[in-house]
């Protein structure tokens, strides 16, 4: 049966979570990608900007479950309007700023 | 220490608005991550979720009851308040409030229960 | 809202027995599981959380398992302390929901 919505957004924070709290080294060796406008769109204005990340496999598995989130295909180099203007951040900032977002929407059971 | 207690009316008639306040002691509800939320027990039975407020004001309710109910919380007295509006026999419950704390994944894992306070509806 | 179904309703053990409470969901809550006790009079107490996890305080004798919808209370040697109703709680996301209990008693 399909993963509720509630369920799959947890997951997704939980793997966020394990980021988080695994990271020994500079996640993705410092790797930096455009910061996003975190009040729409976040699930596909965030693959977005990691699919730009090649080669890290510490963010792989979001890499994926964000694809599931969003409705549309994304492609590297693809840019949306949601991408704050010329401001790159650490994919572990980046990863941490998503974290706290996610579970804001959570705790109001936005779930899709 | 940490400690909740409950205060209420102890009796309320049909169709009146229940007012239940909880005092926390130990803790603030304007540190991040923590959380109150509101159980009942009827007599003799088990337990019921009510409502659920965390530190930055998000709200949740028992989507049976939501048209009743309404948290709040008060920093500055360190209090939560429950109202449930138009009660009814059936109201008739020892009412807790307990803390929540989130916790990387986000846990709803209360903590800390107040001792409870009786609420009878009756005419 | 997920259901939270618990067995059995009462159950009476000597002390000293090994004794399992029960409890499912209706949809997989991926551990986010919580044990409550109440004993009479009093208000509920915390016992076990996430599944498995316990607070500080909590004797080693009580214990936590499962996975997906099925999880287990285990008292490994029932005490006459432990006379009370057992409540697990899903905690996956609200609303929050109570398994009906289950009622300890010594023979």
């Known amino acids: 049966s399909p993963v509720p919505p509630s369920t799959a957004l947890k997951e997704l924070i939980e793997e966020l979570v394990n980021i988080t709290q695994n990271q020994k080294a500079p996640l993705c060796n410092g790797s930096m990608v455009w910061s996003i406008n975190l009040t729409a769109g976040v699930y596909c204005a965030a693959l977005e900007s990691l699919i730009n990340v090649s080669g890290c496999s510490a963010i792989e598995k979001t890499q994926r479950m964000l694809n599931g989130f969003c409705p549309h295909k994304v492609s590297a180099g693809q840019f949306s309007s949601l991408r704050v203007r010329d401001t790159k951040i650490e994919v572990a900032q980046f990863v941490k700023d998503l974290l706290v977002h996610l579970k804001k929407l959570f705790r109001e059971g936005q779930f899709n | 220490e940490v400690t909740l207690r409950e205060s209420g009316p102890g009796l309320v008639k049909p169709t009146q608005t229940l007012t239940l306040t909880c005092t926390l002691y130990?803790?603030?509800?304007?540190?991040?991550?923590?959380?109150v939320d509101w159980i009942r027990q009827p007599p003799g039975k088990g337990l019921e979720w009510l409502a659920h407020?965390?530190?930055?004001?998000?709200?949740r309710y028992n989507p049976a009851l939501k048209s009743r109910l309404t948290i709040s919380k008060d920093t500055s007295k360190n209090q939560v308040v429950l109202k449930l509006t138009s009660v009814d026999p059936v109201d008739t419950a020892t009412y807790y409030c307990?803390?929540?704390?989130?916790?990387?994944?986000?846990?709803?894992?209360?903590?800390?229960w107040g001792q409870g306070t009786l609420v009878t509806v009756s005419s | 809202d997920i259901q939270m179904t618990q067995s059995p309703s009462s159950l009476s053990a000597s002390v000293g027995d090994r004794v399992t409470i029960s409890c499912r969901a209706s949809?997989?809550?991926?551990?986010?599981l919580n044990w409550y006790q109440q004993k009479p009079g009093k208000a509920p107490k915390l016992l076990i959380f996430?599944?498995?996890m316990k607070p500080r305080g909590v004797p080693s004798r009580f214990s936590g398992s499962g996975s997906g919808t099925d999880y287990t209370l285990t008292i490994s040697s029932l005490q006459p302390e432990d006379i009370a109703t057992y409540y697990c709680?899903?905690?996956?996301?609200?609303?929050?929901?109570f398994g009906g209990g289950t009622k300890v008693e010594i023979k």
């Open positions: 307990a803390r929540t704390v989130s916790s990387g994944y986000i846990y709803y894992a209360m903590d800390y």
């Open positions: 130990g803790f603030s509800l304007s540190t991040s991550d923590m959380g």
């Open positions: 407020i965390w530190w930055d004001d998000v709200k």
């Open positions: 949809q997989d809550i991926r551990n986010y």
């Open positions: 996430y599944t498995s």
């Open positions: 709680q899903q905690g996956l996301t609200p609303p929050l929901t």
